[in-house]
């Protein structure tokens, strides 16, 4: 139940692969609002194009719980950290000249894409194991931001809190259908 | 707080094809999975098609295969349900039905108030 | 396809106890199957009360709980008040495609 008000898991990370951050509360929509459907809006400083700019994206391999209950697996999660620069100055861009310029936009790194992902949990006293869909993102990107994008849209892009568009692949008007009924047919 | 509001009631011919559209707000279309269900008059909810966020595509029900196209217009977060060669059969109240945005992956949590189509000669 | 099981309909006293269950022709239902419970009332749509077998929501009262009994997802209400009065759907997962049940009326007298 506690899942609809806050993300009711502990942060277990596996030892030796640092420290995760916190998930926000949930039923917080300004935090969880994308803007612009994820696409990232017009700006006559759009100059270069998105592929040149890149941001980290850090691996976290932790064990997901749900109240007492915890995944029989870890699970590894993506988290989109730091600022965006031309990719061939992120390996080493500390101590750089600011590349944007001063009244152009800024650039963050958020999550693109999520995924679901089956998730088993196993609960304690011999009760019942519990099966879950966890969201995890799946890619990150550099977003373009100006100052004159509002406050409660800088809120969006601390780790974790953005919520990410779907995993979906590309469409001109209408997805692609699974056409594979195996599943279904010969299921379980 | 998502908020799901369809386009009204249709009449049609057997034959014809129908589109009922479903405006999403609160969130973005691209945040949500969006899910078609439908419910023909004094019968039970049948699942007609939806995004599936484990694979990236939209499924569709074996009964529709060919017959339904679910789309999605970004740009204005409207969803999309057309189905085609309709017969009296298709007569119900369509509902899409959106997830929560949440940790955990959890379906059907937000419906349309219903689109009623009639398919009659 | 596969074909989702529910009691056509059950009676339960106010403040007594029921338990609606949903079958799958496949076999036995598991928690891979996510099972959902929905609740509807005449002239409106569908509202969630159970997902993922037993997890509630905040909408849902207390009355209301989930669980699997004897291969069969099962929501059980117990302290029925008359506006439980209702048709209750369960809806299964297969591996991306949803399968609802025929409905249980649930009558309350």
């Known amino acids: 139940q506690g899942w609809q008000a806050f993300r009711n898991d502990a942060t277990e990370v596996i030892p030796g692969l640092g420290e995760y951050p916190e998930p926000p509360p949930e039923n917080n929509q300004t935090m969880n609002r994308a803007e612009n459907g994820g696409r990232p809006p017009h700006h006559p400083y759009d100059a270069k194009d998105v592929s040149e700019y890149s941001c980290r994206e850090l691996h976290y391999t932790r064990f997901l719980t749900d109240g007492p209950c915890r995944s029989a697996k870890p699970v590894t999660e993506l988290v989109c950290s730091g600022q965006c620069g031309p990719a061939r100055l992120l390996p080493n861009a500390i101590g750089r000249v600011k590349w944007w310029r001063p009244n152009g936009p800024d650039f963050r790194c958020i999550p693109d894409r999520y995924r679901a992902q089956r998730v088993q949990l196993l609960c304690p006293g011999g009760a019942a194991p519990r099966s879950r869909k966890v969201r995890l993102v799946a890619s990150c990107k550099c977003k373009r931001l100006t100052r004159f994008h509002n406050q409660s849209e800088l809120k969006d892009f601390g780790p974790e809190t953005a919520r990410p568009q779907k995993g979906r692949k590309p469409r001109p008007g209408a997805r692609g259908a699974k056409a594979n009924q195996a599943e279904l047919e010969n299921a379980y | 707080e998502v908020q799901l509001v369809q386009s009204g009631a249709e009449v049609k011919k057997p034959g014809a094809s129908v589109k009922v559209s479903c405006k999403v707000s609160?969130?973005?279309?691209?945040?949500?999975?969006m899910h078609w269900v439908r419910q023909a008059p004094g019968k039970g909810l049948e699942w007609m098609g939806g995004?599936?966020?484990?694979?990236?595509?939209?499924i569709y029900a074996q009964k529709f295969q060919g017959r339904v196209t679910m789309t999605e217009d970004t740009s204005t977060d409207t969803a999309y349900m057309e189905l085609s060669s309709l017969r009296s059969e298709d007569t119900a109240v369509y509902y899409c039905?959106?997830?929560?945005?949440?940790?955990?992956?959890?379906?059907?949590?937000?419906w349309g108030q219903g689109t009623l189509v009639t398919v009659s000669s | 396809q596969a074909v989702v099981t529910q009691e056509p309909s059950l009676t339960v006293s106010p403040g007594g106890t029921v338990t609606l269950t949903c079958g799958s022709s496949t076999g036995t239902v598991t928690i891979d199957h996510y099972p959902y419970w929905f609740q509807q009332k005449p002239g409106q749509a569908p509202r969630t009360l159970i997902s993922?077998?037993?997890d509630k929501h905040s909408w849902t009262p207390a009355r209301f709980s989930g669980s699997l009994l004897g291969g069969k997802a099962a929501l059980t209400l117990s302290g029925a008040q008359p506006e439980d009065e209702a048709e209750y759907y369960c809806l299964l997962d297969y591996g991306g495609r949803f399968v609802f049940g025929g409905g249980t009326k649930l009558t309350v007298l």
């Open positions: 609160g969130y973005t279309l691209t945040e949500l999975s």
């Open positions: 039905a959106t997830d929560t945005v949440g940790y955990w992956e959890k379906f059907f949590q937000h």
């Open positions: 993922d077998t037993d």
């Open positions: 995004f599936d966020p484990e694979d990236g595509e939209t």
